[in-house]
Each structure stands twice: as C-alpha cells, then as structure tokens.
Interface confidence: low
C-alpha cells in the first residue's frame, strides 16, 4: 500500500501571455498521495468551478480561459491539498496582451494662425502602443512647436501655415500597428496687409494710383475708404495669385484725402480685418499747413489693448518728451484709480479714459485727433458713473483732490462735438453700444451741473431709454 | 550710474539649460520694459525677447518661442532668461538691455556688456 | 517672415556727409515700424544713436540724424568723425505676434 505523500507542485506556474479572444491555459502538475484537491484563484478570489468562461480539467491540474479579456490580467495561483502536510501553491501572471486600438482618432480640425490645435489619438493596447503621426507621406518630426503628448495626441503651437495638410496617428506595439483615417488640418490665416498704400503729395487734376496687397485664408477681399467713407469715383482693379489679393485704385485728384484700404476675411461667425491708410495731398494746399503737434500710429501700449480697436490708428502728442510712454504711464495711472469703482462703472470709464488719451487719429495733412462724441461722455458721466463722477467732484469742491478732476485724465463732456451735429467728426464708444441694447433700466440720476449749454442733454433726472442725449444708434 | 550686468553664461552642451541673470542699477527698474538681444559670433544683433515693466506680458523670437522664457523681479531689479533645449546656434553673447520706456518695445536706450553663452558637445 | 535690409559696408570721407538706409524685404517702412538705429564698435556693446525714426539718444551728436525717406528708414551722417567709423544696425518694430522687433544684418561704415 502506497505511503500518504503531501503535495508537491511539479510544474510551478508560469507567466502566460494571452491575445484578447485567444484561449490562455496555467498547468499545476502535482505530485501527492491520496489525489490533491486543486483550486484555483484569481487575485486571491476564488475561482467558481461553474464559471462558464473557465474549463478545469486532468483534475484541476489544467485551467484554460476560454476566451481572454482586457480584465482578465491578474496573478493566478493554484492551490494543492490533500490532508497530509500543508497545502501549497504556485502563482503566475497572465499578462493580456492587445494589439494597438486607436479608441479615438483625430478628428478635421480648423484653425487661426497662431493658435494652438490639438488632434486627439487616444490608443489601447498591451504593451501600451507608441504613437506617432503622419503628416502627408513623411513622418512628423516633434520640434519646439510639435509634440505628441503622453495620451497620443498632436499639439501644434503657434500654428503655421505651413502646418496645414493630411495627418493620420499610427499606434504600434509588438504585436502589430493601428492607422487612423486621414484627417484634414486647415490653418486660417488673419487678413494681413503685405503692401500699403503709399501716400502721395501731388498737383491738382492728377492722376494716382494707389495700391494695397494683402494676405489671408480664406483669401480677404478689399475695400476702399475715403475720408471714412466709401469711396465715390475712381475704378478699382483687383487679381488674386496665391492667396494674395492685390487692389489698385485710379484717382483723379481734385482735393486732398485719407485713404484706407480694408482687407477682410471670415474666420467661421467672426471677420478680421487689417488696414492701412495713404494720404493723398495737393502739393500747393500743404505749403499752408500749420506744423504738426503729434502723430498718428498704432497703439502698442498694453493698457489699452484691449480697448481700443485692433489697428486702429491712434494720436500721439509731440508735446510730450516721449508721447508714447507718458500716454501709457498717465493711463496706467488712471487705471489704478479706477480700481475702487462699480463693475457698472469701471468698463465704461476704461473705454472713455483709453478713447480720450488715445484718440482716433485722422493722418490728413496734418494729423488730426479725433475727440469723443459728447453723448458718450455724458453717458459713462451721468448714467454709468454717476456716483462716482459726483463723489469726485465733491471733493474736488470741497479741496480733496489738489487738481479735481485732472488726477483722472478725464474728458470734459461739454467741450466736446455732439454727433448729431457732426457724425464724422467725433469718436463712438462701442461698449456703450453694446452695453445700451443690453440695459432695460437705471437708477435716477441727476445731473451734477447745469445744462443749458449743452444741446439736447437731458433734464436733470433721466432714464437711459429715453434720453435723445444718449441715442447711439 | 546707469549699470545693467549680466551673469549665468557659460559651455552647455546642446539639449541643456542655463539661466541667465541681468541685475539693474542706477535708474527705476520697475519704470521700463526690459529686452534679451544676443549677438552670435562675428554675426548681427538679433532681438530675442522683451517684457514690459510689469511682467503683464512676454515676447519672443520665433526661433526661441517654448524653449526660453523672460521673467523679471522688480523688488530684486533682476532680469532673467530661462533658456531650455539648447542648439548650438544659440551661442551668442546675450546682452541685457533697457527700453526708453514702460512698454515693451521702446527703443533699446541701455546696453550691459554682454555674457557669452556656449552651446557644444 | 519680413527681412529688414541694409548695406553691407559703406565708405565716406572724413567732414563727408553718409546716409545708410534700412528697408523690407516686403513692404515700405513707415513710422509705424519706428526705426530706431544702433551703432557697436569692435568688442563694445551696442549704443542708441536715434529712435522711433528721427529721436536722438541723449549724448549723441548732432551730426547724426534720422528719417523716413521714400519707402526706406534712413540714418545721416553729417560731418563724419574718424570714431564713426562701426557697425551700424536699424530695428524695426513689427507689430504684434512672433518677431516682434527685428534687427538689419548691420552695415559697416568705414571713414576713410
């Protein structure tokens, strides 16, 4: 008769490597005397015999999955026992492995120049996939502006035009490699002007033609303005090569003027537009021009960037040492006094603060400031800072400020031109337009100074709705 | 006196970093926008980048753009440059320079005298 | 990506009269780009001689002045001085975006 025998584990068990849907098998031999009972776990939880996804067979010595799964990763141990000594038990991995899945692929993608885009590659598989991508028919080479990111993704900085093209995300692992679709990059690029016109001083009854190049995608279209509004005679002759448009305007020129050439394409919902402007002057009328007391140019401060209109020119005072930074720095002054005041407020006394230190600006012969409309600066004055206006000049009276109401660099509303007299002669606040069709109602306020020398100011209490004074249409 | 003096220059190999330090005296550091302009050998100035007194905003060649980054901290009156991921055509003598006023690009009115910056294997 | 030219060298006489121009490679330089001029002599740092087109740096003489002519930023040199004899470099200021602010290759004036 044979001698009881604990278990000994003959063939301890292995790392197996299984493809998902493909059968995986652990063997526990076992040596012992009686028969072991052999049981299975996995990530020490039982197996269930009746677990249709297993077959245990040669008495428990054979476990087979039958068809692998992602979840299905773990250690798995057999344990043997028979009563004699202990039980024992050996355990190995299974490790599912997968060929690489693009789970979610990039997608055609429209987008500005200088922006940031982003192509999603989101990859399974096991090994974990290494994703690269595909621009055209070369392979995409990652430089300050290109990386793929650890999820797979594209990420484009400060998009090019150049980036533009087919792109397609390849995931590869050991096991084999995964494609995406081709998808589509397209770059817009802002309207850009490559050639101004250039500004002429020429005899009466001459003919000039002025010329205005510009970039863009989509291709922008051009207009013409003169001294602010459409140009009325003159023929206008335009080719397009290469996403460049170019726009030669004829003249016969009688009188002296401003011209703006706008260019402008459309970037989904919203347009951008670049302009540029040429003077065209008559050689005898300029000889009688006074000297200039500053100069039109692009604001590039940043206190105001977000104010003023993108482009737009702006005036510069030569009286100022260094007209540019003293308009910034008595601007940046302005800015911290007007931290204290309502949300109601602060944007209106932004916009008219930046529009009245940095006025439009009309290059002409002479380059001319073009000063706030006084119905904006009675609004932002009487309904949207009223409070405020009033407190500070309260203690403007009562000798708090030194200089009243010069610590702010503010207008003074009753000295300005009224638009209704002129509308080309003075500057819209656009926020107050916009501000207007959103507000249904306001406060009382009353007026902090006598109106009779103001045309169409309203009486002393007033409601937005119904002021003339304020129609901003 | 008006001084600006730079430091942090040096031999890196290609793919490392170096931090370079610009500190100001003589005038209100936090009144100007401050600019990097770097000069490779034998060759033209190149604007690298700007910022303006308040730090609000930052500027860059497009050749350095992701790779360096211009900070400032007034109350030390200090100008820094972070350069990342260098090549070996970054090597230049990098001058600290003052701008004529607050924003970011005035003229350039000050110049320091320059650190050489290495980039090789 | 616009180029910002410039003679490579250039010669005048001392007492003559110089001028050096800086222009794009596409386009017209116009006071919105405000030219401001340089000059760096061998193993100095570079000096502001004018900015934004005609403003002269304090200290810097008379005889150097600036200007917007045609479609060009121009730097004069009247009366030139042996010590005038550098590197001279414009720079341009080209708006918002990448390369905001772009140097000329320089040209060499040499004073005979």
């Known amino acids: 008769e044979k001698l009881p025998k604990a278990p000994v584990i003959t063939t301890p068990l292995e790392t197996v490597d299984a493809l998902v849907e493909e059968v995986a098998t652990f063997m526990c031999a076992v040596e012992s005397y009686p028969q072991p009972e052999i049981s299975w776990t996995r990530n020490k939880i039982l197996i269930k015999l009746f677990d249709t996804r297993y077959s245990i067979r040669e008495n428990g010595q054979l476990l087979t999955i039958l068809s692998v799964e992602d979840s299905d990763d773990g250690i798995y141990c057999c344990i043997a026992n028979n009563g004699v000594g202990g039980a024992v038990e050996s355990c190995g991995a299974l490790q599912v492995k997968m060929k690489p899945k693009i789970t979610r692929p990039p997608i055609n993608v429209k987008i500005i120049e200088g922006l940031k885009a982003v192509l999603p590659c989101t990859t399974m598989g096991n090994p974990k996939p290494s994703v690269s991508w595909i621009k055209g028919d070369n392979a995409l080479r990652e430089n300050s502006r290109i990386a793929v990111l650890e999820s797979g993704s594209l990420r484009i900085h400060n998009v090019q035009k150049e980036d533009a093209g087919q792109y397609r995300c390849v995931a590869k692992n050991s096991l084999g490699t995964a494609y995406s679709k081709l998808v589509k990059l397209e770059v817009e690029v802002f309207a850009r002007i490559l050639r101004a016109p250039e500004s002429h001083n020429v005899t009466f009854g001459s003919f000039v033609t002025l010329r205005c190049t510009a970039i863009g995608i989509p291709v922008p279209t051009i207009s013409w303005i003169e001294n602010g509004n459409a140009v009325s005679s003159g023929s206008i002759q335009e080719s397009v090569k290469d996403r460049v448009i170019d726009s030669r305007l004829q003249l016969f020129i009688t009188k002296p003027g401003l011209y703006t050439c706008i260019a402008t394409n459309k970037h989904g919902e919203k347009f951008s537009t670049a302009k540029a402007a040429a003077t065209v002057s008559i050689a005898e009328w300029s000889k009688s021009q006074k000297d200039s007391q500053g100069y039109c140019a692009q604001y590039r401060g940043e206190v105001c960037d977000a104010v003023l209109a993108k482009d737009a020119l702006v005036f510069f005072n030569t009286s100022y040492r260094d007209p540019e930074d003293a308009q910034e720095l008595l601007i940046h002054t302005a800015w911290n006094e007007l931290k204290a005041v309502s949300p109601l407020c602060r944007p209106a006394a932004e916009a008219l603060l930046c529009n009245h230190l940095f006025q439009e600006c009309s290059p002409g012969v002479v380059p001319t400031p073009m000063p706030i409309c006084r119905e904006y600066c009675l609004a932002v004055k009487e309904l949207f800072c009223a409070k405020e206006w009033q407190a500070m000049e309260g203690k403007a009276h009562r000798g708090l400020y030194r200089s009243g109401m010069h610590l702010l660099p503010v207008p003074e509303c009753s000295k300005l031109p009224s638009m209704h007299r002129d509308p080309t002669a003075c500057t819209r606040l656009p926020y107050l337009d916009y501000k207007k069709e959103n507000i249904t109602t306001f406060p009382s306020i009353t007026s902090s100074r006598p109106s009779a020398d103001i045309p169409n100011l309203p009486a002393s209490t007033s409601s937005f709705a119904v002021s003339p004074a304020y129609s901003m249409t | 006196e008006l001084q600006l003096v730079e430091s942090g220059g040096g031999l890196v190999q290609p793919g490392g970093s170096l931090r370079l330090s610009c500190a100001a005296s003589?005038?209100?550091?936090?009144?100007?926008?401050m600019s990097w302009v770097r000069q490779a050998p034998g060759k033209g100035l190149e604007w690298v980048s700007a910022?303006?007194?308040?730090?609000?905003?930052?500027y860059y060649k497009e050749s350095v753009k992701g790779r360096f980054t211009i900070s400032r901290d007034n109350a030390k009156k200090t100008l820094y440059l972070q350069m990342n991921s260098l090549k070996s055509e970054d090597t230049a003598v990098y001058y600290c320079?003052?701008?004529?006023?607050?924003?970011?690009?005035?003229?350039?009115?000050?110049w320091g005298q320059g650190t050489l910056v290495t980039v090789s294997s | 990506q616009a180029v910002v030219t410039q003679e490579p060298s250039l010669s005048v006489s001392p007492g003559g009269t110089v001028t050096l121009t800086c222009g794009l490679s596409?386009?017209?330089?116009?006071?919105?780009?405000?030219p401001d001029w340089y000059q760096q002599t061998p193993g100095q740092a570079p000096r502001t001689l004018i900015y934004?087109?005609?403003s002269r740096h304090s200290g810097v003489p008379s005889r150097f002045s600036g200007s917007i002519s045609g479609n060009k930023a121009a730097l004069t040199i009247t009366g030139a001085q042996p010590e005038d004899e550098a590197d001279y470099y414009c720079?341009?200021?080209?708006?918002?975006?990448?390369?905001?602010?772009?140097f000329g290759g320089g040209t060499k004036l040499t004073v005979l």
């Open positions: 934004t087109t005609n």
């Open positions: 003589g005038f209100t550091f936090d009144d100007y926008g």
């Open positions: 320079a003052k701008r004529s006023g607050r924003i970011a690009f005035g003229a350039l009115d000050a």
């Open positions: 596409s386009g017209s330089v116009t006071s919105s780009n405000y």
């Open positions: 910022i303006p007194w308040n730090g609000g905003s930052t």
């Open positions: 720079a341009l200021y080209m708006g918002g975006g990448s390369n905001v602010y772009v």
